[in-house]
Amino acid sequence: VKMAETCPIFYDVFFAVANGNELLLDLSLTKVNATEPERTAMKKIQDCYVENGLISRVLDGLVMTTISSSKDCMGEAVQNTVEDLKLNTLGREICPAVKRGVDLFLTGTPDEYVEQVAQYKALPVVLENARILKNCVDAKMTEEDKENALSLLDKIYTSPLC
Amino acid sequence: VKMAETCPIFYDVFFAVANGNELLLDLSLTKVNATEPERTAMKKIQDCYVENGLISRVLDGLVMTTISSSKDCMGEAVQNTVEDLKLNTLGREICPAVKRGVDLFLTGTPDEYVEQVAQYKALPVVLENARILKNCVDAKMTEEDKENALSLLDKIYTSPLC
């Protein structure tokens, strides 16, 4: 049985970014038909993970897993698909809590982003890592880069691959 | 608001193992009162992640996220806590699909474990990585080590931190 998962292409792109492997990221970006400016924006985010070393990739993976398996996400999925549940199926759309976290990572202040992460994982090392990544992204990315990253995310969320 | 998540201490231990950072693993193991033999067993698993390099940590994180956010896990959580849902709460117990995967990782054959992973993430690079990790664990761990790892997992699943 092949399980339906919540927006698999989103997690593929997220892990390609966090992994630091540019070849895998290039492939994921091709799969979602990313434009040149969108590619540039995502690679700037990847640079932050690479510069911050292995620990940032693993800790951010932990945050993503924690949010994705949180009451928030499960509750959302449940409430959005009560009818589906009776048929034992579940919607594949991305969990709003994950979406919110990604939006804050790009458009929020460092404090807002860290506060959102803290709702799910309050370990000091996790929060410190979240702040370092957020500061790096704010330093590297122009407003235009952030808009391009958001437009790519919209493309991902509405993609048939999601 | 601090969100309830499905067995947070399990994910702490999993990511500490997969991260390859022994200091984080020591901390997680202390939290669940791991015995010396249980510590030894978990460190043998961690050695496999370290030896297999960064890619195994990221890919296994992807598998864990995918399973944790799969229809299987969400469905289980929902069906197990229908009453709770009416009160807008969700049980924190670990998802049975995650439990199954971990059990097979320790006690199943490589084929059984890879087949379980393939239900959630069929990318060849993911499955190859899963097989390498499983073979490494089978080579490194004695039957006694595996029993100790399983006893620690029981401790985690029944812990108030779960």
Epitope: N21, L23, D26, L27, E36, V50 | -
Partner: antibody, heavy 115, light 107 residues
Amino acid sequence: EVQLVESGGGLVQPGGSLRLSCAASGFTFSTYAMHWVRQAPGKGLEWVSSISGRGRNSDHADSVKGRFTISRDNSKNTLYLQMNSLRAEDTAVYYCARTEYFHHWGQGTLVTVSS
Amino acid sequence: DIQMTQSPSSLSASVGDRITITCRASQDINNYLAWFQQKPGKAPKSLIYGASSLQSGVPSKFSGSGSGTDFTLTISSLQPEDFATYYCQQYSSYPFTFGPGTKVDIK
């Protein structure tokens, strides 16, 4: 208009080396992964190597691992394939291509490995 | 590695015919499949990506369908310039792999 032009092919003895080049134009070269694909005479297509947009990561087919190295110079918009320890079975037309679904191809350059 | 198979390996058809070529992947590749046309002595030409999206400039007589493991390329009305070899390729994951090709010649 996207253009890819390969060069550097020729006749080489078994065990010898050759460096292929692919000059790219018409797109932002550093934004895209680039690839080498080959075709032995009368045979099908075989992926050989890929390199990420900024050259941080690469991958090679098992048949060429340890012998071939892909690289790129983004300042020159050029892709390279360094081929060492060549064997008769490496005889093929070598194409460079852009994007993972090989949207654009060069015209190819023939590499013949023979004594 | 993902194996790609194509059928038939060759087919003879007449101008105006509608033909279908099948490509099968050894495991689920979602819709990450491309189709190419190659004429003797020439580089391959990209026809379709994403299983069904037509490359710009490719005539609409070409169409692709499928998802998961089974895919088809259809040419609705064969023209003299369409006699060539057709290849499928998966780009779901490295290493990228091609089908062995289907040669379409004049009956």
